[in-house]
Amino acid sequence: SERCDDWGLDTMRQIQVFEDEPARIKCPLFEHFLKFNYSTAHSAGLTLIWYWTRQDRDLEEPINFRLPENRISKEKDVLWFRPTLLNDTGNYTCMLRNTTYCSKVAFPLEVVQKDSCFNSPMKLPVHKLYIEYGIQRITCPNVDGYFPSSVKPTITWYMGCYKIQNFNNVIPEGMNLSFLIALISNNGNYTCVVTYPENGRTFHLTRTLTVKVVGSPKNAVPPVIHSPNDHVVYEKEPGEELLIPCTVYFSFLMDSRNEVWWTIDGKKPDDITIDVTINESISHSRTEDETRTQILSIKKVTSEDLKRSYVCHARSAKGEVAKAAKVKQKVPAPRYTVELACGFGAT
């Protein structure tokens, strides 16, 4: 056959669906690779063809659209499973072509099994709720397009294994789950199961997401430098190792980039000639506030190094702060044996 623009295997779109549930999968060509949509392509006389390669096989084969009850069907640029089976797992290809044009892309589809508590190998989206922030909602995700607006589905919400009912601060409201006041105890996996009828059959859509309760913007502050501070002086003799920790607390801020860096005499360590190393460690609180520690280390400090200015800087979306470390050269201790002996008139 003639040349075809092959976009390869789009592993960015690792699609995971539950066994025995409907799945609607849009051809990624129109979403990520081509500058026109399906309607335009169809009007221009292009045909969308689907085929697949089973798991652990190399052979591309056409998709069987003549299964009982139309279990697999195509509608415009969507491939439908009503429902999926475990052995539908494989790489699926959609190809758009006519006599003069051809473009195709493949993507992996994994049909996964869940246990009785909705645990599975499915990668879960994370939804962050602000702690004690007032009413916040999560919405049952990725259920659009499965049934018409005239169909009224039933939605059951679970936290872990248990139906959400009589919870103090969590209320199911159809497709939404409302948190009246989010607390750390609300951390966990939440599952909505949408049940709807279609052509005399009942279908279920299971969607699980992880809720993480994080620090509220109401409580957010600019970065706080705990160290260096005015109470600690780094006194060293030449030849000793100089270690100065810069420890900074960052309030949780959605999509904020937290930065910590040192300057030595106003320059970044990379821009000066002395042999300095920086080691960073990061820890998080239960509400995802962040503590970053950067330890500045000079293995064998010189008297010149001890005269330099060492400043720790920190920046977040809330602001920028800086703090200088107090560094000085240790005054040599008196050599007591000699001096005291002289004092007593020893010859």
């Epitope: 025995d20 099994q113 869940k114 246990d115 508590c117 059951t156 139906k163 199961v193 009942t202 279920h204």
Partner: antibody, heavy 117, light 107 residues
């Protein structure tokens, strides 16, 4: 379409055990709950317990705890209900009922178990 | 265990009549209520789940409503094929429990 086919009628002596099977087809056996419900002659429905064949998780009604055992064979898509220490009041029709969640969407045809000396 | 009380235990109505069956729970069940239909000598069939969700293939003359502890099954226009016993069942808290049943007959 979903089908649950149960084993045939049984006549048992008091003190013995009975094992009723329920063969499932037309859906993913490991992804739904299999419930067991009984109905004594002329009486209402009584839930006994359920099993999730995917991971073997079971829940039993307190009344039957220790006397009923629910199992599932994934290779044959068959669920089993074994009731031991039978007495005359266990005479009933025993149903299996499949539910993706908690409602029992589809039921087997029922198995009559008669306990008589 | 949650007790489910159905009323009436039996009723007789004419074809085309509106029929109402009620079910009362011994505590709130948060709409986690199903209705089943059982015809003589047959297995039960799910009619309605989660108080008001019509199961696939069930005629629209069947409807459910209620909240808290009190729930209702309504047949808007009784048909000869609706002769059966109807059971409510809670699935709020294990063990699942059924009402005693309501036998519906044609006058």
């Amino acid at each position: 379409q979903v089908q649950l086919v149960q084993s045939g009628a049984e006549v048992k002596k008091p003190g013995s055990s009975v094992k009723v099977s329920c063969k499932a087809s037309g859906y993913a056996f490991t992804s739904s709950w299999m419930n067991w419900v009984r109905q004594a002659p002329g009486q209402g429905l009584e839930w006994m317990g359920r099993i999730y064949p995917g991971d073997g998780n079971t829940h039993y009604a307190q009344k039957f705890q220790g006397r009923v055992t629910l199992t599932a064979d994934k290779s044959t898509s068959t669920a089993y209900m074994e009731l031991s220490s039978l007495r005359s009041e266990d005479t009933a029709v025993y149903y299996c009922g499949e539910g993706y969640l908690d409602p029992m969407d589809y039921w087997g045809q029922g198995t009559l178990v008669t306990v008589s000396s | 265990d949650i007790q489910m009380t159905q009323s009436p235990s039996s009723l007789s109505a004419s074809v085309g009549d509106r029929v109402t069956i009620t079910c009362s729970a011994s505590q709130g069940i948060n709409n986690y209520l199903n209705w089943y239909q059982q015809k003589p000598g047959k297995a039960p069939k799910l009619l309605i789940h989660y108080t008001s969700g019509l199961h696939a293939g069930v005629p629209s003359r069947f409807s459910g409503s209620g909240s808290g502890t009190d729930y209702t099954l309504t047949i808007s226009s009784l048909q000869p094929e609706d002769v059966a016993t109807y059971y409510c069942q809670q699935y709020s808290i294990l063990p699942w429990t059924f009402g005693g049943g309501t036998k519906v007959e044609i006058k």
